[in-house]
């Protein structure tokens, strides 16, 4: 079970243009929160470790996944060619 | 930070080619698409296209033909407006188009006028 | 013809008032969530407040809440202050292989009594 977290925002830095969220999961041995169909869900923590994040799948269906350049994240490509991108930090 | 600017908007005559450009910094094209979004004076916010970060560019149905979205860089995507009219009278703002459009640019005027 | 009707287009509240704002959408926005919310002042850009029509885009107050799904959203800004007086937008997303991939309703002007 998992649930969106907002993180509260540091003062101290400048504002964000990327919303800084997390998912708080309850998961068992061997899994970590992560996303699968664009939705926050326990994963398998060697997904997380090596970053292939697209074996998470995390793109919802008919969406294609890539992974950007140094495996920072990924992309999910929508059927009709729109681009949504996600960084891990 | 992560920011964009327009430039090239500028008094032009009816049927005059134009060209704006949009430069972007911190973050990277190849990461992420941008749409172009104009306002006429006074009016509401209206969608011309986007270029998603593999080049693909996509347009409102309206703008077709007329507007032409391209990268012409790795920091510059530039929106190309043939046979302006004064309809076409605007603030031309471009913005990183993710989840939501965030952050946009200040916006250029663009005033078609004989 | 890709239609996103907003109501009302002006309103006035009072500081420390709710008000709400609605975007209806003519077919359903890509995964029923696809909506944004921006708030414009003028000789501004716009501002993200929302996307994915409830989640709060980073460093905008809790005061302003989103809510809906497919074709019907609303906007709630509730505990009114001065600073909220601008004009609010709804944006949605649609699926480019069909139609325009981006709308704008038509703006609603918030007016502080």
């Known amino acids: 079970t998992c649930e969106i977290v907002t993180l509260d925002r540091d003062s101290s830095q400048p504002r964000r243009t990327i919303a800084r969220q997390t998912a708080r999961c309850a998961c068992r041995k061997g899994q970590i929160a992560g996303t699968t169909r664009a939705r926050p869900a326990c994963v398998d923590a060697r997904i997380i470790k090596t970053k292939q994040w697209c074996d998470m799948l995390p793109c919802l269906e008919g969406e294609g996944c890539d992974l950007l350049i140094n495996r920072s994240g990924w992309t999910c490509t929508q059927p009709g060619g729109r681009i949504k991108t996600t960084t891990v930090s | 930070q992560e920011q964009l600017v327009e430039s090239g908007g500028r008094l032009v005559t009816p049927g005059t080619t134009l060209t704006l450009t949009c430069t972007v910094s911190?973050?990277?094209?190849?990461?992420?698409?941008v749409s172009w979004v104009r306002q006429a004076p006074g009016k509401g916010l209206e969608w011309i296209g986007y270029?998603?970060?593999?080049?693909?560019p996509h347009y409102a149905s309206w703008a077709k033909g007329r507007f032409t979205i391209s990268k012409t860089s790795s920091t510059t995507v530039d929106l190309k407006m043939t046979s302006l009219t004064t309809e076409d009278t605007a603030t031309y703002f471009c913005a990183r188009d993710n989840y939501g459009m965030d952050p946009w640019g200040p916006g250029t005027l663009v005033t078609v006028s004989s | 013809e890709l239609d996103l009707t907003q109501t009302p287009s002006s309103v006035s509240a009072a500081v420390g008032g709710t008000v709400t704002i609605n975007c209806q959408a003519s077919?359903?926005?890509?995964?029923?969530?696809?909506l944004a919310w921006y708030q414009q002042k003028p000789g501004q850009p716009p501002k993200l407040l929302i996307y994915?029509?409830?989640t709060l885009a980073s460093g905008v107050s809790s005061r302003f809440k989103g809510s809906g799904s497919g074709t019907q959203f609303t906007l709630t800004i509730s505990d009114v202050q001065c600073d909220d007086a601008a004009t609010y937008y709804c944006?949605?997303?649609?699926?480019?292989?069909?139609?325009?991939?981006?709308?704008f309703g038509g703006g609603t002007e918030l007016e502080i009594l």
């Open positions: 270029i998603a970060n593999n080049y693909n």
């Open positions: 944006q949605g997303e649609f699926s480019c292989s069909s139609a325009d991939c981006n709308a």
């Open positions: 911190g973050f990277s094209l190849s990461s992420y698409g």
């Open positions: 994915a029509a409830s």
């Open positions: 077919q359903s926005v890509y995964n029923n969530k696809n």
